[in-house]
């Protein structure tokens, strides 16, 4: 059955919502990435008008394996400290919480998940003038929310009013089982300047208790682009492939689920020494997209133009120097071989994938590399004939979301 809907009549505050979304110049698109090919044969056509992108996103708990591709390491290896389960080690699997995309408001059918996205939530994006309707359901066991870093106009969907006693939507928790509908509008101030790349790399997270919510896994990528940078499907024009990379130190000691992870994964939970520095160190996971020790293996087609949206978010407090072995990339109009990322920031770079082979993606900080912050990048020929080109993907927003009198009823 559908989620029950709240119906509204004669409400005096929805003009801003009505006016925004029934504008004849605004197209409405429900983003669905299920069928997106990995490359295109024809360059995308830019869209002319602002769009409203509708996303159904849930916070969901699950067991996360940081190293699904790594065999049990030798006990003397560096990896073993992080990956082996034992009396004082949780190992590679931890209960975490993730942002998951769904196809509609029933929150029954998940959107397809790409392995390389890892722990990241769905890729959200919009151009200046676009609106993102975020239908968020908290399917976890504790309060969380979803809030963008990089969009300033964020409000509840049907009016600007916040509940009495709430100063800012960023701090407002959505409780277990609850659905909350947000409206994010991308303003000129949010968008790139002339000296920026076409799309800025930003993120969204839960901000109820940002440090702990983030340590627990709630993070996703957000691209903010200037007008006519993305096509009808949201793919950046002049790019064949978009890749999101999150360099993140997940401090599982700060996760909301630490106690539960100890209870579930340690053979003798009562015997664990929580203050033991080695135990604490074993719970600090130096990851790329939530994977450690080359468990993230990216594939890119030879000769593709690839945009890379790279984030540094997590417990790391210093800058990261990121490299792609075998490659230089263009960053702010300059070719570079190392990208400097400051904490809680993102950068956009692109490169032409001209060197076939298996390459390393990592950071110059050897301490982080030794602790697992490396991934593999495979560049090889692709059969272009198997790809289908992008077509416009429109779907009228459901009548219950957009009807002029705001009557919201089950379909």
């Amino acid at each position: 059955p559908e989620e029950p809907q709240l119906r509204m009549k004669n409400n005096e505050e929805a003009e801003d919502y009505d006016d925004d979304l029934t504008d004849s110049e605004m197209d409405v698109v429900r983003f669905d990435d299920d069928n997106s090919p990995s490359f295109i044969q024809i360059r995308s056509v830019a869209k002319k008008h602002p769009k409203t992108w509708v996303h159904y996103i849930a916070a969901e708990e699950e067991d996360w394996d940081y190293a699904p591709l790594v065999l049990a390491p030798d006990d003397r290896s560096y990896k073993s400290q992080y990956l082996n389960n034992g009396p004082q080690r949780i190992g590679r699997k931890y209960k975490k919480v993730r942002f998951m995309a769904y196809t509609d408001e029933t929150f029954k059918t998940r959107e397809a998940i790409q392995h390389e996205s890892g722990i990241l939530g769905p890729l959200l994006y919009g151009e200046v003038g676009d609106t993102l309707l975020i239908i968020f359901k908290n399917q976890a066991s504790r309060p969380y929310n979803i809030y963008p870093h990089g969009i300033t106009d964020v409000r509840p969907l049907y009016s600007r009013r916040l509940p009495k006693g709430v100063k800012h939507l960023k701090d407002f928790p959505i409780l277990p089982g609850e659905i909350f509908k947000y409206k994010w509008t991308v303003t000129v101030e949010d968008g790139p300047t002339k000296s920026d790349p076409r799309c800025l790399t930003r993120y969204y997270s839960s901000f109820v208790n940002m440090e702990r919510d983030l340590a627990s896994g709630l993070i996703g990528p957000l691209l903010i682009c200037y007008k006519e940078s993305v096509d009808q499907r949201g793919n950046q024009i002049m790019s064949d492939k978009r890749n999101v990379i999150l360099f993140s130190v997940f401090d599982e000691n700060r996760s909301w689920y630490l106690t539960e992870n100890i209870q579930r994964f340690l053979p003798n939970p009562a015997g664990v020494q929580l203050e033991d520095p080695e135990f604490q160190a074993s719970n600090i996971m130096h990851s790329i997209n939530g994977y450690v020790f080359d468990s993230l293996q990216l594939s890119v087609c030879l000769h593709e133009v690839a945009y890379w949206y790279i984030l540094s978010i997590g417990a790391q407090t210093d800058f990261l120097s990121v490299f792609f072995s075998g490659y230089t990339f263009k960053h702010k109009m300059v070719y570079e071989d190392t990208l400097t990322l400051f904490p809680f920031s993102g950068e956009t770079v692109f490169m032409s994938m001209e060197n076939p082979g298996l390459w390393i993606l990592g950071c110059h900080n050897s301490d982080f590399r030794n602790r697992g912050m490396t991934a593999l990048l495979k560049v090889s020929s692709c059969d272009k004939n198997t790809g289908d080109y992008y077509e416009d993907s429109y779907e009228d927003i459901s009548a219950y979301l957009l009807s002029k009198n705001n009557a919201i009823e089950p379909r």
Epitope: E3, L6, R142, P156, L157, S159, R160, P163, L175, G177
Partner: antibody
Amino acid sequence: QVQLQESGPGLVKPSETLSLTCTVSGDSISDYYWSWIRQPPGKGLEWIGYFFYSGGSNYNPSLKSRVTMSVDTSKNQFSLKLGSVTAADTAVYYCARSQLRYYLDVWGQGTTVTVSS
Amino acid sequence: EIVLTQSPGTLSLSPGERATLSCRASQSVDSNYLAWYQQKPGQAPRVVIYGASNRATGIPDRFSGSGSGTEFTLTISRLDPEDFAVYYCQQYGSFFGQGTRLEIK
């Protein structure tokens, strides 16, 4: 001082839809979360659902396929519709104001609904 | 869905005695969202404790709440005749426990 008053038919036939309205006086319906709770005869409290006018809602999973909540800000009223009722839906129905879902601080006096043919 | 289990089902005590009511959650609950209600026959419930340990307006100081995680307690230090009623705990503004009936012995 805030007051809540439930109203609606006291008798509903099986398979029909139960409709109740809660009229709020002394407060703006736009500023709070609002809840419906019921209590079958001789039993405990059962949460039905709550909503916030600007875009928040949460419903008891065991009831949500039958529940519709609506709000009319011009009348400062909110309503509950419960479809396909059976005798098990016989109860005292309460509306209540929720302080940010921390707790229910103001309750209506309750209205008894009997489902019977 | 988090299930709240209250114990005992019925508590028989005399005025002046101390009452201890328990509420156990099937999963950890943020204590900000744990409330206790009192209901007397023929009346609507009223909140006595919110945020696990904060007394609601007009509630006498003999009522206190404590606990965190999965274990919460409502304590009435010296029972007054008017305290005999049914008490419910509630989490996250939604589900209630099944109730504890506090009756005069």
